[in-house]
């Protein structure tokens, strides 16, 4: 099947990072520089796309690959393929229109990013809290009080709070 | 609320200089890119160019270095200048908070320039 | 620079109906791409980014779809508060552009 595509298109067998130029008898020629093909049998390379503004290069473009942006320091990534730049906040903050605040008694967001969440409210599970929640910091979870009985043992110190979450971008 | 507020010359003459300049409240003013915008009467919108807290500065090649910008960052304020104007130029000036897209924008400043 | 061409020009659509307005890019963009809203007398409202993404406070109604150089956005049941003038914006590359727009008008 390869060997009858390429009788019939002889743009099949250019590979990625160059196009089939027709001004020049369908021969194979590199991408101009700022411009990428990702895949083979393309007629034009596709130009790459501009890290400016709000966004910063994550990843070179190169003849193969289209250029990839994050956010510049102090901002995050919102939607597909980093389309929009978002204020960060300091953990036990949200974003909010007038700008980032502190979560609110009972919430707490151990982010940079995000909105504040209720603290886990223990006594759903029968659980007592062993540790109290921060606006940075859910609270922590022990046995239920019927568990410590008098004299028992002193209950196994909490595992150390997990370090914030970092989405993929 | 970020909210901008805009203000400046309405009526010019050719050749004399427009001068637009634009408040940010609420919100956080540094690390944000700040642009102008304009829209003919009846027409479409063109992106005039953008500047950030530090005086980074972009513009549309079409206006063919008649424009400056600038950044008050003690008043949260930035500025448009564009000189020589022309009945082309007429237009409502707007300038909006760039995010990737624009996201806030000005109310609005219309400029007639007449002889 | 990249050339953004909408269509069509108007749309004349009854209330309570669907909308599909198109947005072609002369050259790929990716998804990078937003929409707005504007009715008369006011400023450009952000509605749409990252081609499908929508902005904050944005109602349901409004969805959009496409890469490349192809999109669309929709309206599913067009509100009397949703005629106006739409454009789309890509900024994938500088000079950032608008497309001409696309008038959505009562039938």
């Known amino acids: 099947f390869e060997r009858t595509r390429s009788l019939q298109d002889p743009c099949s067998n250019c590979p990625a990072g160059t196009f089939c130029d027709n001004n020049r008898n369908q021969i194979c020629s590199p991408c101009p520089p700022n411009s990428f093909s990702s895949a083979g049998g393309q007629r034009t390379c596709d130009i790459c796309r501009q890290c400016k503004g709000v966004f910063r290069t994550r990843k070179e473009c190169s003849s193969t690959s289209n250029a990839e942006c994050d956010c510049t320091p102090g901002f995050h990534c919102l939607g597909a393929g980093c389309s929009m730049c978002e204020q960060d906040c300091k953990q036990g903050q949200e974003l909010t229109k007038k700008g980032c605040k502190d979560c609110c008694f009972g919430t707490f967001n151990d982010q940079k990013r995000g909105i504040c969440r209720p603290w886990t409210n223990c006594s759903l599970d029968g659980k007592s809290v062993l540790v109290n929640g921060t606006k940075e910091r859910d609270v922590v979870c022990g046995p239920s009080p019927a568990d410590l009985s008098p004299g028992a043992s002193s209950v196994t110190p909490p595992a150390p709070a997990r370090e914030p979450g970092h989405s993929p971008q | 609320q970020v909210q901008l507020q805009q203000w400046g010359a309405g009526l010019l003459k050719p050749s004399e200089t427009l001068s637009l300049t634009c408040a940010v409240y609420?919100?956080?003013?540094?690390?944000?890119?700040w642009s102008w915008i304009r829209q003919p009467p009846g027409k479409g919108l063109e992106w005039i160019g953008e500047i950030n807290h530090s005086g980074s500065t972009d513009s549309n090649p079409s206006l063919k270095g008649r424009v400056t910008f600038s950044v008050d960052t003690s008043k949260n304020q930035f500025s448009l200048k564009l000189n020589s104007v022309t009945a082309a130029d007429t237009a409502v000036y707007y300038c909006a908070r760039l995010t990737g897209p624009f996201d806030y924008w000005g109310q609005g400043t219309l400029v007639t320039v007449s002889s | 620079e990249f050339v953004m061409t909408q269509s069509p020009a108007t749309l004349s659509v009854s209330p309570g109906e669907r909308a599909t307005l198109s947005c072609r890019a002369s050259q790929s963009i990716s998804s990078i791409l937003a929409w707005y809203q504007q009715k008369p007398g006011q400023a450009p409202r952000l509605l749409i980014y990252?081609?499908?993404t929508r902005a904050t406070g944005i109602p349901a109604r409004f969805s959009g779809s496409g890469s490349g150089t192809e999109f669309t956005l929709t309206i599913s049941s067009l509100q009397s508060e949703d005629f106006a003038v739409y454009y789309c914006q890509q900024y994938y590359n500088w000079p950032l552009t608008f497309g001409g727009g696309t008038k959505v008008e009562i039938k």
């Open positions: 990252g081609a499908s």
């Open positions: 609420g919100g956080s003013f540094s690390g944000y890119y």
